[in-house]
Amino acid sequence: SSLGGTDKELRLVDGENKCSGRVEVKVQEEWGTVCNNGWSMEAVSVICNQLGCPTAIKAPGWANSSAGSGRIWMDHVSCRGNESALWDCKHDGWGKHSNCTHQQDAGVTCSDGSNLEMRLTRGGNMCSGRIEIKFQGRWGTVCDDNFNIDHASVICRQLECGSAVSFSGSSNFGEGSGPIWFDDLICNGNESALWNCKHQGWGKHNCDHAEDAGVICSKGADLS
């Protein structure tokens, strides 16, 4: 038995690790699944953050793992992306769903960040240059759309390059190649890693490499 306290928990199951799999919510002592109607990257971001896997990689409309069983607790989940828990997002009501089956169980792929790398290139030192990120084994760039000093601050701190001195777009440090991993990132400047900023999803963009972004950090400026 239990005495009070919140009666809700969240987990990802049947995935490759604790940061991927079928979404399950424990409500009133019972684990159940989430239907994929209206499933979005915003919901995935909330889940990833809640589980301490802060990088939302993708939002499969169904669980890549096996279908769940038991109750379907949530449907038409609608998140802004800044909620602290999945159950703070709007939905149809607990246990209410539109004839969902477990074939529609929602899934999530987050990252714990351990397989991600970042570097600055073509700037003459490690603390200035074009931003490149290694994701799923491939190096790619960041688009300059809405890129600002808050983004640069996150990058410089993450790379232990001091504070941000300046940022640039329009492939100021040359055009990269490969994927363009991020576009229209929203950072407040306090994130511990660039991929913890709000984004539309890895590889989602409307850019080309002529828009690759770059930064100069204080430790890079000192070396110039």
Epitope: S1, S2, G4, G5, T6, D7, K8, V27, Q28, E29, E30, R71, W87, D88, C89, K90, H91, D92, G93, W94, G95, K96
Partner: antibody, heavy 116, light 107 residues
């Protein structure tokens, strides 16, 4: 349709134990739902006391501490509220209530008076 | 525990009036608020779940809204059969808690 009916002693002396029964018809208490006890004090204040789920797991209001126990008899399709060491403060109308998550189905209530 | 502060405690109304009852939670409870109607000598009847969803058979003159800490229950045009006590309750976290009730009375 789910129907719930409470029954109890009506009058209990202070320091005694109270036992109430909720008899459920039209639905098996092991099929689904949480099976709750809620009481309403004179003056209308409602207090959720606790539940037992269809799988037999219980959850209690911490304000009732070790005073409360909710059990069931699946063969009779009944669940029970036991409240130990009652005081006059436990005078109230007691409702059994059920639903998947929400308080969807309510019994008519049974009035309990604690008095010497 | 989450405290649900319900106002007003009573309302003197005329048939046809628009009535608004508010509930304020002591912390965010997302959309997890329900509203109940209790007529004299009867048990509470659920009207609204998850802040704004009417139960089947509940007339559409009853509406609920709100998110976070502030919630509103409205009867667009009060009928004689609506005279009752109305309660809010939060379903967000255990223990579930209720407002103190609002009694509708005829002027």
């Amino acid at each position: 349709d789910v129907q719930l009916q409470e029954s109890g002693p009506g009058l209990v002396k202070p320091s005694q134990s109270l036992s109430l029964t909720c008899t459920v018809t039209g639905y098996s208490i092991t099929s689904d739902y949480a099976w709750n006890w809620i009481r309403q004090f004179p003056g209308n204040k409602l207090e959720w006391m606790g539940y037992i789920t269809y799988s037999g797991i219980t959850n209690y209001n911490p304000s009732l501490k070790s005073q409360i126990s909710i059990t069931r008899d699946t063969s009779k399709n009944q669940f029970f509220l036991q409240l130990n060491s009652v005081t006059t403060e436990d005078t109230a109308t007691y409702y059994c209530v059920s639903g998947t998550y929400y308080f969807d189905y309510w019994g008519q209530g049974t009035t309990l008076t604690v008095s010497s | 525990s989450v405290v649900m502060t319900q106002t007003p405690k009573s309302l003197l109304i005329s048939i046809g009036d628009r009535v608004t009852i508010t509930c304020k939670a002591s912390q965010s409870v997302s959309s997890d608020v329900a509203w109940f109607q209790q007529k004299p000598g009867q048990s509470p009847k659920p009207l609204i779940y998850y802040a704004s969803n009417r139960y089947t058979g509940v007339p559409d003159r009853f509406t609920g809204s709100g998110y976070g800490t502030d919630f509103t229950f409205t009867i667009s045009s009060v009928q004689a059969e609506d005279l009752a006590v109305y309660f809010c309750g939060q379903d967000y976290t255990s223990p579930r808690t209720f407002g103190g009730g609002t009694k509708l009375e005829i002027k």
